[in-house]
Amino acid sequence: APVPPGEDSKDVAAPHRQPLTSSERIDKQIRYILDGISALRKETCNKSNMCESSKEALAENNLNLPKMAEKDGCFQSGFNEETCLVKIITGLLEFEVYLEYLQNRFESSEEQARAVQMSTKVLIQFLQKKAKNLDAITTPDPTTNASLLTKLQAQNQWLQDMTTHLILRSFKEFLQSSLRALRQM
């Protein structure tokens, strides 16, 4: 697994470097998670032909994965910092159960899957420090999460492969949208 942000050898070798600002730390954390997702996608694509599946076929899935919409205030038109930040944190919290699902889905990248999960937790904590209105954030209901996880794990092999691919693709897209929005804040 790659070394988490702030622990690479360059950081150790340059103690005089200015400490990262909160925004830089968040940016670096997202890019680190995106690198981890790329590695996981590589294993998924090597293992199955899901990556060639047409967008239309993938769109027919019934997964309720977090997605950015116009009303979330994260796009350039209608940008709203606080609304967007709430959406990013809420979305990341909603992705947690899907990241839990991914934990047993990889053979050679098991550590990488765990690193993505743990790094996402760290990112959520960074973002919470930035948010002014935590009351607007609804956390996932554990009972709902449990039945979702059970349902996902009960799928046949082909559907599990498809689900893994969809989670990684959606999470990547969500993080990329988040990164663009956070750079405007």
Epitope: L93, E96, V97, L99, E100, Y101, K121, I124, Q125, Q128, L134, D135, I137, T139, P140, P142, T143, N145, A146, S147, L148, L149, T150
Partner: nanobody, 118 residues
């Protein structure tokens, strides 16, 4: 598994306050979510509020602004501070822990009775 022990219930007059505690013992206590539920007499158990691993809290509409959940990780304890109590808050209160994001509430306290008299 984690053992949860609820305490702090009692008889209180309408408008009064109580603080319930939920102490955890067992393996390392860092659950995904801790929740409070209640079961009024003759009714089904209902959600009161929860606090997730990162400290974000959510409450049922009926208790918003009156009840506050907090946690003390050093003492492995979660609290439910109940202010401006009403007779309809009378119930057995339970705390519950979800150990992981996909586990559901997999540990429950034994419950503590709260009675609010008018």
């Amino acid at each position: 598994a984690v053992q949860l022990v609820d305490s702090g219930g009692g008889l209180v007059q309408a408008g009064g306050s109580l603080r319930l505690s939920c102490a955890a013992s067992g393996r390392t206590f860092s659950p995904y979510t801790m929740g409070w539920f209640r079961q009024p007499p003759g009714k089904v158990r209902e959600f009161v509020g929860r606090i997730n691993w990162s400290g974000i809290r959510n409450y049922a509409d009926s208790v918003k602004g009156r009840f506050t959940i907090s946690r003390d990780n050093n003492n492995n304890t979660v609290y439910l501070q109940m202010n401006r109590l009403k007779p309809e808050d009378t119930a057995v209160y339970y705390c519950a822990a979800a150990s992981q994001s996909g586990s559901g509430y997999d540990s429950w306290g034994q419950g503590t009775q709260v009675t609010v008299s008018s």
